[in-house]
């Protein structure tokens, strides 16, 4: 590794990768091993970030970028740049401080992580429930009563259906 | 665990030089820098200088360019301060500390207890 | 060289209280300071670097701040263990220098 000074700041001709080392007379120096500068003219590399425990490597650290950690299966990334690990729950579940728990009727979670949201009130928008919701789902809205006099049709029909093989024109 | 053992004291006479040790463990002695610093009862802290194991490389303040010398011996990872000519401004506590090479900050992550050190006849 | 001032060195305070000590470079140090807590018994140990960053093993009651020339050591829920003497030391060029100490007595 080519070790350089320059005539002006010394530090400033320090690429990405190295150091300017105070103490060698302000050269610049390649980052000791698990340590990384990813912008020019630093006195100090940076500790990579070590993913240990809950958290797996997604990117491995190298002299110009800092390692990126995801979690291990069961659990899912917090905050920026996964600072944290939450657990998984099913759908249909809320992580407490007990652990998993099934969502209170009423409400659903549709998804491994986050809180159970209540269902959607259908009659604040006029409307009325077509399909109930679960733990998993939320409720279906479908037309207001109003709207289902008789001979209407509350399902929207099918759009015609295309021959395998075909294309549009 | 890091430590840096040092001695608990040391007299010395006048003229008479003397040499502090700072022997480590815990760690890979040859990756971090070894510091030396002067504490003088009820004052502050001067850096002395400090040598990188590996390969013997040192620095100094100029303020104590002619009263120290750093060395180190790899095979007892023990770090070495020669103090020349001795008066009675050279009476305080010397420590050892390290810090590793190229990052942190430069700053000293873990520090000996101290050699006191006292000048008289 | 250098230098490193701290204005302040000694401060009463009671357990519980919020404690801010300075330091101040004669000239910007990029944020290369260091602060050092020294017990009565001499043990010296590392508290922060690199104005912010914690070191391993240090509670989160002791934090750093500040920039260019000026910096301070934040202790926000004072404990008796805390009473000790607090260096700050600059890292950006040799050579290495520190505040003169702020000494942290308890009411």
């Known amino acids: 590794f080519e070790r350089t000074r320059s005539l002006q700041d010394p530090c400033s001709n320090c690429p990405a990768g190295t150091f300017c080392d105070n103490n060698r007379n302000q050269i610049c120096s390649p980052c000791p091993p698990n340590s990384f500068s990813s912008a020019g003219g630093q006195r100090t590399c940076d500790i990579c970030r070590q993913c240990k425990g809950v958290f797996r490597t997604r990117k491995e650290c190298s002299s110009t970028s800092n390692a990126e950690c995801d979690c291990t299966p069961g659990f899912h990334c917090l905050g920026a740049g996964c600072s944290m690990c939450e657990q998984d729950c099913k759908q249909g579940q809320e992580l407490t401080k007990k652990g998993c728990k099934d969502c209170c009727f009423g409400t659903f979670n549709d998804q491994k992580r986050g809180i159970c949201r209540p269902w959607t009130n259908c009659s604040l928008d006029g409307k009325s429930v077509l399909v109930n919701g679960t733990k998993e789902r939320d409720v279906v809205c479908g037309p207001s009563p109003a709207d289902l006099s008789p001979g209407a049709s509350s399902v929207t029909p099918p759009a015609p259906a295309r021959e395998p093989g075909h294309s549009p024109q | 665990q890091v430590q840096l053992q040092q001695p608990g004291a040391e007299l010395v006479r006048p003229g008479a030089s003397v040499k502090l040790s700072c022997k480590a463990s815990?760690?890979?002695?040859?990756?971090?820098?070894i510091n030396w610093v002067k504490q003088r009862p009820g004052q502050g802290l001067e850096w002395i200088g400090n040598i990188y194991p590996s390969d013997s490389y040192t620095n100094y303040n100029q303020k104590f360019k002619d009263k120290a010398t750093l060395t180190v011996d790899k095979s007892s990872s023990t770090a070495y301060m020669q103090l020349s000519s001795p008066t009675s401004e050279d009476s305080a506590v010397y420590l050892c500390?390290?810090?590793?090479?190229?990052?942190?900050?430069?700053?000293?992550?873990?520090w000996g207890q101290g050699t006191s050190v006292t000048v008289s006849s | 060289d250098i230098q490193m001032t701290q204005t302040t060195s000694s401060l009463s305070a009671s357990l519980g209280d919020r404690v801010t000590i300075s330091c101040r470079a004669s000239q910007d140090i990029s944020n290369y300071l260091n602060w050092y807590q020294q017990k009565p018994d001499g043990t010296v140990k590392l508290l922060i670097y690199?104005?912010?960053r914690l070191h391993s093993g240090v509670p989160s009651r002791f934090s750093g701040s500040g920039s260019g020339t000026d910096y301070s050591l934040t202790i926000s829920n004072l404990e008796q263990e805390d009473i000790a003497t607090y260096f700050c030391q600059q890292g950006y060029t040799l050579p290495y220098t520190f505040g003169g100490g702020t000494k942290l007595e308890i009411k």
């Open positions: 690199y104005t912010s």
């Open positions: 500390t390290r810090f590793p090479d190229g990052y942190y900050s430069y700053a000293m992550d873990y």
């Open positions: 815990g760690y890979t002695f040859t990756s971090y820098w």
